[in-house]
Interface confidence: medium
Amino acid sequence: MMTGTIETTGNISAEKGGSIILQCHLSSTTAQVTQVNWEQQDQLLAICNADLGWHISPSFKDRVAPGPGLGLTLQSLTVNDTGEYFCIYHTYPDGTYTGRIFLEVLESSVAEHGARFQIP
């Protein structure tokens, strides 16, 4: 029985050239988290494995930093970074939990004006 829930930062906006933290939190379960995958559409960005620690995909090494915690920091944002991001928690005995974040990368002035309309 999967009792857990994933809380995410939801829909977020950030400005071009800046950085953003993608954060997910698994709650309401005592399951062991054995690995967390971060994916953008069908591309694997990073893995945090309970035994091995962090692995960042080579194509994202320059712009992706692990943490804080099980989160992921995206740096030097471009408009092409706009899209869906998924945190996938592998747990035992529950199985797989998936959280979704939508990131919109905006030109600097637009991001400043749009910040107050972020969905938490």
Partner: antibody
Framework: EVQLVESGGGLVQPGGSLRLSCAAS????????MSWVRQAPGKGLEWVAT????????YYPDSVKGRFTISRDNAKNTLYLQMNSLRAEDTAVYYC????????????WGQGTLVTVSS | AIQMTQSPSSLSASVGDRVTITCQAS??????LSWYQQKPGKAPKLLIY???TLASGVPSRFSGSGSGTDFTLTISSLQPDDFATYYC?????????FGGGTKVEIK
């Protein structure tokens, strides 16, 4: 080339024990989650056990929990399955598999080793 | 445990035929479904993962689709090498479970 070679199968009496081994080569063994899957003669596939890359976490279905133990020696690139209190229904070909958490699938399988539990 | 129901359990087809195999999960498994091919006396081989992504080296005549509870494996033009048994497997929840298999035979 990724290779998984199982050994240790054979005939054992009900209640007996057996230890299967799986020698891995062609990849960095210590970086991968590994599993055992079995197939009874003429039947389908059944997941038996999984162990995390460093060996810290092990997982079993209820059908073998408490009787089977999965372990690994990363220095020897070898996966093990210790099977105790064997029953007739454990008769099967046992496959060693590499489990990819980034694919949510088993991407490489060994050729299998047959375990027969009979008196 | 999540039950995986495959249909049909067997089918007869000719070279060049389009073949469709379905797999139904007893509860939502998102896209965490894989398909394997097994030939007699051989180990299973991964064909498709995450419901629709082709594994490395698998011919493009194989395709997968679906999410939630209903999934499909399609072979667009059956080749002599494709006569085998096909299994689906869910990776959503422990224990990982397989479908009962679909045997594809020569008509």
């Amino acid at each position: 080339e990724v290779q998984l070679v199982e050994s240790g199968g054979g005939l054992v009496q009900p209640g007996g024990s057996l230890r299967l081994s799986c020698a891995a080569s062609g990849f960095t063994f210590s970086s991968y989650t590994m599993s055992w899957v079995r197939q009874a003669p003429g039947k389908g596939l059944e997941w038996v056990a999984t162990i995390s890359s460093g060996g810290s976490y092990t997982y079993y279905p209820d059908s073998v929990k408490g009787r089977f133990t999965i372990s690994r020696d990363n220095a020897k690139n070898t996966l093990y399955l210790q099977m105790n209190s064997l029953r007739a229904e454990d008769t099967a070909v046992y496959y060693c598999t590499r489990w990819l958490l980034s694919l949510y699938a088993m991407d490489y399988w060994g050729q299998g080793t047959l375990v027969t539990v009979s008196s | 445990a999540i039950q995986m129901t495959q249909s049909p359990s067997s089918l007869s087809a000719s070279v060049g035929d389009r073949v469709t195999i379905t797999c139904q999960a007893s509860q939502n498994i998102n896209v965490w479904l894989s398909w394997y091919q097994q030939k007699p006396g051989k180990a299973p081989k991964l064909l498709i993962y995450k419901a629709s992504t082709l594994a490395s080296g698998v011919p493009s005549r194989f395709s997968g689709s679906g999410s939630g509870t209903d999934f499909t494996l399609t072979i667009s033009s059956l080749q002599p090498d494709d006569f085998a048994t096909y299994y689906c497997q869910q990776g959503q929840t422990y224990p990982f479970t397989f479908g009962g298999g679909t045997k594809v035979e020569i008509k």
